[in-house]
């Protein structure tokens, strides 16, 4: 199945030419997408070519400047933010990284009123993260650690927190594990839907044992970077939940919100929160075990001042077959009755889709059923009840956005995404405006990506937001590989995989074969998406065959797939790849003397296992910072599918699992590790135990570091990393320079 | 009636301890953030320590840090005040008061702490 | 820490006059975060008007505060024989809550 749009050939086959790395490396390939910044029904904020930043209302069609570019280059604004009540816009500057999705900035407020700065009682700098309140202009900002409340941006500043430590305490912001494996944000703060309340965690990360690496830099000395981050099987962050009356706070003061007593009774985390009015708010807490989800609805407590959590209100959400949720456990959707809510978990059937809570879970009336998965509930509104699932067409790969009206009976359903352009767009999100007015669909593929707005009620398209036709006219010229996606049927398991292919494909000829993998647990690799990246260049130019298989652990397919690998991680995700290149084998267009596979992360932890599996089947392989023990990574996410590395729980797995276990093995493959010195999320610790262990065996290897590089080997880095794997998988195919 | 009750004042040496009490009544205590403030004679107030409602955080004025703790038992509805190495200057009528930082709506009758040799 | 000062130090009036009394923050207060207290001789302090420039609970509407900033004022529109007592502004926006150094209101 062809899954790239074909495109009508230039007669002169000399005016195509292949890819290039340069190509790949400059990103002359890359799209665009366009997210509006809805600030109600029917407007939204866009940042223009020219960095004006542009209000759009989209029933008078009319568009004006609230920023002009002259006033964001006057602080170097590389982001912005306008308050609710429309006086004033944030401007950050100064961006500094810290972890994947934290980061401190400067920021500026300036007042559209007046056309001017506020100033007297500016912001302290560097910030960690900041927010306008829902409603009117309040603003809630973490500075070293500590949360402030500012009534009106030129007022001083209220401090709710004093406890904030460097390292220590973490107030309305994640540590490390947190962020990471847990929020996924860079905030741990939130406001009641009207501004009248602030709900923010505090994570004590005092007894948490510290990862301690060298930073180079250019000084004389190195300096040390220290994180708590807590291993699997260490002490793990305790946190805890406030909330402020941001009226007058400096009254009642930040009350805590109790912890369910069934998850209290032992280690737990906290897992989201979501507002459901101004004076409900929902938590979910997970336990350490993280099979078990409660699901708490708390209510404000006028007359005491207090949140009232009753045990009335806890939802409980087990897995008996794996753990709890998919990646992370799934969070509510509040309906407008706001005490019943929608959920994706999974039915009896072991597949996930939307239920709809109205007293208890196990009363949850299933409102998407099927051999496919719900994926993601983007809205619910008085009638209407948006998400996308995998359902159209049995293919797990792709993302259709389905409407549900919630207001008739029976409720019917709507595929809004499928025949929209059918062969370009079979992988969606989407945006919505308040009251689901109005959306934003944004297609990733298989074709040329393509940003849409629609109208919420009729879902007829109104304008095309992004199609790019330049990128389309860039590629008129290119001679792209031939991309398609299908399954194979091994043991009653279906191991759906993409296959990458060269311009010219023959198949009565033999190509060099390259696995991609990443293969953790609740990912997907095969997904109908567009992308011109290193493995396009490897087909298009080298001449190479590129897969991509989703074995056992990969999501979306059910949780007889998904959850095979609990307590057993790096076994079946390498035998699935394994049995994949033995299927693509027989095919009969693979050279079974060239074969490769190479992987990142988790990726790199699987890639090493298959290369070590004895099979005889990889000529060579690239691991590029990947884990080699369970041991060493954190525990959120290890323990999740790991369980403890104890004696009475799950240690002889986690020492049977590592990577150095099987150093002999590599006696017979070329295998070339690869690892950034300043890795934050894998530490450089893994690589340095396998090259240890590669050692001690006298297995030979190759090896490349990147000084002072984290997880994603970012900047020039990515330029010398892609050309040397290049390199590298070249001489091992014995393909020319 | 929000009553406020405080206790365990009296003369002591410098250097000494002391333990104040203050047993509220009338109202949900586990619910508030509670405060002791001072009054040294014929002066004015000065705010002393804070405790918020659940007794996760607790704030201190620079003169007592690192002498006076503040604690609290909801289930007895009784806030505390642990001073040791007390000097002649903590001499003062010492009030508990419902509220955290500002706007205290209800505070007891006060107890006195002499601290002299 | 912000200092209070209060002023006049002592008020001089008869009952039935109106009283006003100022309060100078040394930095930016605003009114969500000063309260006014009242309190007479041998007992506790009594709220009057709560941050927010609320009147507190059963205190008679004579009272008002106004003010933002830096600059607060109590008003006492006619005071009663009962108001002759030490008026004290508090602020709860920054660490430590602070008091200012008192207003006495005397009967002239």
């Known amino acids: 199945i062809v899954l790239r749009p074909s495109r009508v050939h230039n007669s002169e086959e000399n005016t195509m030419r292949a890819l290039t790395l340069k190509d790949i490396l400059n990103g002359t390939f890359s799209y665009k997408t366009f997210f509006p910044n809805w600030i109600s029904g029917q407007e939204y904020l866009h940042q223009s070519a020219d960095n004006n930043i542009v209000l759009y209302n989209i029933e008078t069609g009319q568009s004006y400047t609230i920023l002009s570019n002259r006033t964001m280059k006057s602080v170097n604004a590389s982001n912005y933010g306008l308050s609710p009540d429309r006086q004033f816009v944030y401007l950050e500057s100064d961006y500094s990284k810290l972890w994947r999705y934290s980061y401190t900035a400067t920021y500026y407020i300036y007042d559209l009123s007046n056309g001017e700065f506020v100033r007297g009682n500016e912001l302290p700098r560097p910030i960690q993260y900041l927010c306008w309140s829902p409603v009117g202009s309040k603003l809630a900002y973490v500075y070293q650690n500590n949360i402030y409340l500012k009534q009106r941006p030129g007022d001083p500043p209220f401090q709710i927190t004093f406890n904030g430590r460097e390292n220590k305490i973490f107030n309305g912001i994640p540590d490390w594990v947190y962020e990471e494996e847990m929020l996924a944000t860079k905030y741990a703060l939130w406001w009641s839907p009207n501004g009248k309340f602030l709900a923010y965690a505090e994570f004590n990360d005092t007894d948490i044992p510290v990862i301690a690496y060298s930073y180079y830099g250019d000084e004389q000395y190195p300096r040390t970077i220290n994180i708590p981050y807590p291993k699997a099987g260490a002490k793990n962050p305790v946190v805890r939940i406030f909330i402020i009356d941001t009226t007058y706070p400096a009254y009642v003061g930040p009350q805590e919100v109790p912890v369910p007593a069934m998850i209290a009774s032992s280690d737990y985390y906290f897992s989201w929160l979501t507002w459901v009015t101004d004076e409900r708010v929902c938590l979910q807490w997970l336990k350490r075990v993280q099979n078990v989800s409660v699901l708490s609805i708390c209510d404000f407590r006028e007359d005491w001042q207090t949140w009232d959590c009753p045990k009335t209100q806890e939802h409980i959400e087990e897995s008996r077959t794996g753990w709890a949720g998919g990646f992370f456990v799934s969070t509510p959707v509040f309906s407008y009755d706001a005490i019943s809510y929608y959920k994706i978990f999974s039915d009896k059937d072991g597949y996930k889709h939307i239920h709809y809570i109205k007293d208890t879970v196990e009363n949850a009336i299933q409102i998407t059923s099927g051999k496919w998965e719900a994926i993601n509930i983007f809205r619910v509104t008085q009638d209407s009840l948006f998400y996308s699932s995998n359902e159209f067409e049995e293919y797990p790969g792709r993302r259709n956005i389905y409407r549900i009206s919630i207001g008739s009976y029976p409720p019917s359903k709507k595929c809004v995404t499928c025949h929209l352009r059918k062969e370009r767009c079979q992988y969606y999100t989407a945006s919505f405006s308040d009251y689901a007015k109005y959306y934003a669909l944004v297609c990733y593929g298989p074709g040329i990506p393509i940003s849409t707005l629609h109208d919420g009620r009729t879902d007829q398209e109104i304008k095309i937001l992004e199609e790019n036709k330049e990128l389309e006219n860039a590629l008129k010229n290119i001679q792209l590989p031939k991309e398609e996606i299908k399954k194979l049927e091994v043991d009653e398991i279906t191991l759906w995989y993409k296959m990458i292919l060269p311009p010219q494909f023959d198949r009565s000829k033999k190509y060099p074969l390259l696995i991609q993998v990443y293969g953790g647990p609740c990912s997907q690799s095969v997904r109908s998406v567009f992308a011109v990246n290193w493995i396009s260049y490897l087909a298009s130019k080298e001449g190479m065959v590129i897969a991509l298989v989703d074995g056992r652990g990969t999501a979306f397919q059910g949780d007889k797939l998904l959850y095979a690998v609990y307590r057993k991680l790096g076994v079946y995700e390498v035998e699935d790849q394994i049995t994949a290149v033995r299927k693509f084998i027989e095919m009969g267009f693979i050279d079974e003397k060239r074969i490769a596979i190479w992987g990142w992360s988790y990726g790199g932890y699987v890639s090493s296992l298959a290369l070590a599996s004895g099979t005889g089947l990889f000529k060579c392989g690239i691991a590029v910072a990947p884990v080699s023990s369970w041991e060493y990574y954190a525990s959120v996410y290890t323990e999740r599918f790991m369980g403890l590395p104890t004696k009475d729980d799950n240690l002889e797995h986690y020492k049977n699992s590592t990577v150095m276990a099987r150093a002999e093995y590599f006696r017979n493959v070329d295998y070339l590790l690869i690892h950034g010195t300043a890795d934050d999320n894998v530490h450089f610790q893994n690589s340095a135990q396998i090259a240890k262990a590669l050692v001690n065996a006298q297995v030979d290897f190759q090896a490349m570091w990147y000084s002072d590089q984290n997880h994603g080997l970012s900047g020039l880095s990515t330029n010398h990393l892609y050309t040397h794997m290049t390199h590298f998988l070249k001489q091992c195919f014995s393909l020319s320079d | 009636e929000v009553q406020l009750l405080e206790s365990g004042g009296g003369l002591v040496q410098p250097g000494g301890s002391l333990r104040l009490s203050c047993a509220a009544s009338?109202?949900?205590?586990?619910?508030?953030?509670m405060s002791w403030v001072r009054q040294a004679p014929g002066k004015g107030l000065e705010w002393v320590s804070a405790i918020i409602s659940s007794g996760a955080s607790t704030y201190y004025a620079d003169s007592v840090k690192g002498r006076f703790t503040i604690s609290r038992d909801n289930s007895k509805n009784t806030l505390y005040l642990q001073m040791n190495s007390l000097r002649a200057e903590d001499t003062a009528v010492y009030y508990c008061?419902?509220?955290?930082?500002?706007?205290?709506?209800?505070w007891g009758q006060g107890t006195l702490v002499t601290v002299s040799s | 820490e912000i200092v209070l000062t209060q002023s006049p130090g002592t008020l001089s009036l008869s009952p039935g006059e109106r009283a006003t009394l100022s309060c100078r923050a040394s930095?930016?207060?605003?009114?969500?975060?000063l309260a006014w207290y009242q309190q007479k001789p041998g007992q506790a302090p009594r709220l009057l008007i709560n941050?927010?420039?609320r009147r507190a609970t059963g205190i008679p509407d004579r009272f008002s505060g106004s003010g933002s900033g830096t600059d607060f004022t109590l008003t006492i529109s006619r005071l009663e024989p009962e108001d002759f007592a030490v008026y004290y502004c508090q602020q709860g926006i920054m660490l430590p809550p602070t008091f200012g150094q008192g207003t006495k209101v005397e009967i002239k």
């Open positions: 941050v927010g420039s």
């Open positions: 009338g109202f949900t205590f586990s619910s508030y953030a």
């Open positions: 930095q930016s207060v605003t009114s969500s975060y």
């Open positions: 008061a419902k509220g955290w930082f500002g706007g205290f709506n209800y």
